[in-house]
């Protein structure tokens, strides 16, 4: 699997940001489809449990996530993007995503480190 | 087979209310955030709705907001759009759209006339 | 809210020929944009996605191209069947925009 993200993400506290990540594959999409998002702090503590799709999505029970991710994900378009809702400054960090598609279980995980601001200062500003 | 069907629409008056429905059939629905389009007389295409999975966050154009409601029932397979203080711009075949667009509907048309 | 451009407006053409709309897009959109086919009487159809992908069972006389504010629809030889209207739409930023139309015609 091949994954492409934008790798770097500016967006303002309060808002929602969409953080994109699509694939390839040699194998075609099914129902073993598999996406695992994960998110690194910037002050080094330890990886937190953000998202999991397979089929179905699954929302994060507990934690800094809960009630503020969304899957926005499409296999058919090869889409295995999410929604997060109201930025806070502590989410800035990197979020990784995993996808396997078995037989084609194996890649480079994709990685979008997100800089959550006060105010916009460049046009890389993802809504949605 | 992926199917979307609208329904709902019809002849409203200015500040009328409209609801409008749209059946979801051959895809896992709860899985997929979904929209509704609108298309003007003049042919214009307009996003008027979005829902996402979940907890069903949801998002408006700056013309419709405060008086569109999008929600939907997973259980049911259905995708709404309430619609509220109608003015005779919201004049339109209205579609409801997997995810960013992937599929539509056929439509059901709107029409905001006294 | 971004202005999707979109050129032509209509294109008469024969069949066999090649044909090019674009879209500009009023700021960077990365390549978060789709095209769409609209035939007489139907709704749209996905055609194009992420700019350059094209969707399941689209044949591929049609491409897209372009990334930031510049995108190019192709169809590398229409036949009768492509008369429609083809929109372009951006879906970076909300409020989601779409471009004005082009109606292709077949002499």
């Known amino acids: 699997v091949e994954i492409y993200t934008s790798r770097v993400l500016e967006a303002v506290n309060g808002t929602d940001a969409r953080l994109k990540c699509t694939f390839s594959s040699f194998a075609p999409v099914g129902d073993a489809l598999t996406v695992t998002w994960n998110f690194r702090p910037l002050d080094g503590g330890p990886e937190q449990f953000v998202f999991y799709y397979h089929i179905d999505p699954f929302q994060p029970m507990s934690g800094r996530f809960k009630d503020r991710v969304s899957w926005d994900g499409n296999p058919e378009r090869y889409d295995a993007s999410i929604l997060l809702w109201k930025l806070q400054f502590d989410d800035n960090g990197t979020y990784t995503c995993q996808v396997k598609n078995p037989p084609d279980v194996d890649g480079v995980i994709g990685e979008i480190r997100l800089s959550v601001v006060h105010t916009v200062r460049f046009s890389e500003i993802h809504f949605l | 087979e992926v199917k979307l069907v609208e329904s709902g629409g019809g002849l409203v008056q200015p500040g009328g209310s409209l609801k409008l429905s749209c059946a979801a059939s051959g895809f896992t629905f709860s899985s997929y955030t979904m929209s509704w389009v609108r298309q003007t007389p003049e042919k214009r295409l307009e996003w008027v709705a979005y829902?996402?999975?979940?907890?069903?966050?949801?998002y408006y154009p700056d013309t419709v907001k405060g008086r569109f409601t999008i929600s939907r029932d997973n259980a049911k397979n259905t995708l709404y759009l309430q619609m509220s203080s109608l003015k005779s711009e919201d004049t339109a075949m209205y579609y409801c759209a997997r995810h960013r667009g992937d599929y539509w509907g056929q439509g059901t048309s709107v029409t905001v006339s006294s | 809210s971004i202005v999707m451009t979109q050129t032509p407006k209509f294109l008469l053409v024969s069949a066999g020929d090649r044909v090019t709309i674009t879209c500009k897009a009023s700021q960077s959109v990365s390549n978060d944009v789709a095209w769409y086919q609209q035939k007489p009487g139907q709704s749209p159809k996905l055609l194009i996605y992420?700019?350059?992908n094209r969707y399941t069972g689209v044949p591929d006389r049609f491409t897209g191209s372009g990334y930031g504010t510049d995108f190019t629809f192709t169809i590398s030889t229409v036949q009768a069947e492509d008369l429609a209207v083809y929109f372009c739409?951006?879906?970076?930023?909300?409020?989601?925009?779409f471009g004005g139309g082009t109606k292709l015609e077949i002499k």
């Open positions: 992420y700019a350059s």
């Open positions: 739409q951006q879906d970076y930023s909300s409020p989601w925009t």
């Open positions: 829902i996402t999975t979940g907890a069903g966050r949801t």
